[in-house]
């Protein structure tokens, strides 16, 4: 089992909002859960979008997942990882 | 250490409000996380009420929605509970409570408060 | 609103024996559940959050299982102080709801 690195950046978005990513990395088996959530329960998948989880050449895989935000609510927002019974979550960058 | 304690009458009568308040230390509440009121009934069921956030925003339970109003004096530190034209249904042990935006589960509570709504 | 179904209500268990709890949720909470602990006249405590992950200073004894709607929380080697109330909780959305709770008693 490799874990993955997990890297949450943020863009700017329409006025007043930003688009926040997580990405996961170098992990491997390829199963993984990578999801936002707000207010510490799920996030609707409608107001979510996911990558594929990809080969990334190194016999590891990569995924992503974005959500868009009102600028000022980044601490309501964490994005959570599990894979292979661990865990971690990961708070937008200020 | 966060450290809750909550506080208010221990009797109220039918159809009046109930109040509480719950006095937080080692945490200032407007810094992160969300500030939440459980309430835990005779028989032990529990019921989570609402929230008010760092920030003042409120969510609450739908069950209570219309009476229920969680406020907060920033000042103090403090956090508290309204609940309107109670009933006896409302006698309950009062908890306050809080958690991370990681995962809305209770990592401390308050060692809580006996309300009772008697004549 | 999703509701969470405990069972059993109650059970009698000896100290070194092992227990389960059982917790249905009424959809899927995607592993959205925490257990908690409670003593008589005493607050709630956390056992297990993230459904597997067990809180700090929890006794190893304790783990936990489950996906999708089913849930569990057991206990080895049952200790004098696990007697007492175990309550689960999902955070999959609002309001969070508990189950009715499970009382283990002394045989």
């Known amino acids: 089992t490799v874990p993955p690195m997990v890297n949450v950046t943020r863009s700017e978005a329409s006025e007043g909002n930003i688009t926040v990513t997580c990405r996961a990395s170098s992990f491997y088996p390829r199963n993984i859960i990578l999801t936002w959530r707000q207010d510490g329960v799920s996030l609707s998948h409608a107001t979510q979008q996911w990558g594929d989880v990809l080969p990334d050449g190194n016999g590891t895989y990569q995924t992503w997942v974005a959500t868009r935000i009102c600028r000022g609510e980044e601490q309501r927002f964490t994005c959570y990882m599990e894979h292979s019974g661990n865990h971690s979550t990961h708070p937008v960058p200020s | 250490d966060v450290q809750l304690q909550e506080s208010g009458p221990g009797l109220v009568k039918p159809s009046q409000s109930l109040s509480l308040t719950c006095t937080v230390t080692g945490y200032s509440i407007t810094s992160d996380y969300a500030w939440n009121w459980i309430r835990q009934f005779p028989r032990n069921k529990l019921e989570w009420m609402g929230y008010?956030?760092?920030?003042?925003?409120?969510n609450y339970n739908p069950s209570l929605k219309s009476r229920i109003s969680i406020t907060r004096d920033t000042s103090k530190n403090q956090f508290f509970l309204q609940l309107i034209s109670v009933t006896t249904e409302d006698t309950a042990t009062y908890y306050c409570s809080y958690y991370r935006y990681d995962g809305a589960w209770f990592p401390y509570w308050g060692q809580g408060t006996l309300v009772t709504v008697s004549a | 609103d999703i509701q969470m179904t405990q069972s059993p209500a109650s059970l009698s268990a000896s100290v070194g024996e092992t227990v389960t709890i059982t917790c249905r949720a009424s959809g899927n909470i995607h592993n959205y559940l925490a257990w908690y602990q409670q003593k008589q006249g005493k607050s709630p405590q956390l056992l297990v959050y993230n459904a597997i992950m067990l809180a700090d200073g929890v006794p190893s004894r304790f783990s936990a299982s489950g996906s999708g709607t089913q849930y569990s929380l057991k206990i080895n080697s049952l200790q004098p102080e696990d007697f007492g109330s175990y309550y689960c909780?999902?955070?999959?959305?609002?309001?969070?709801?508990f189950g009715a709770g499970t009382k283990v008693e002394i045989k």
């Open positions: 008010i956030n760092y920030s003042g925003t409120t």
């Open positions: 909780q999902h955070f999959w959305s609002f309001p969070l709801t």
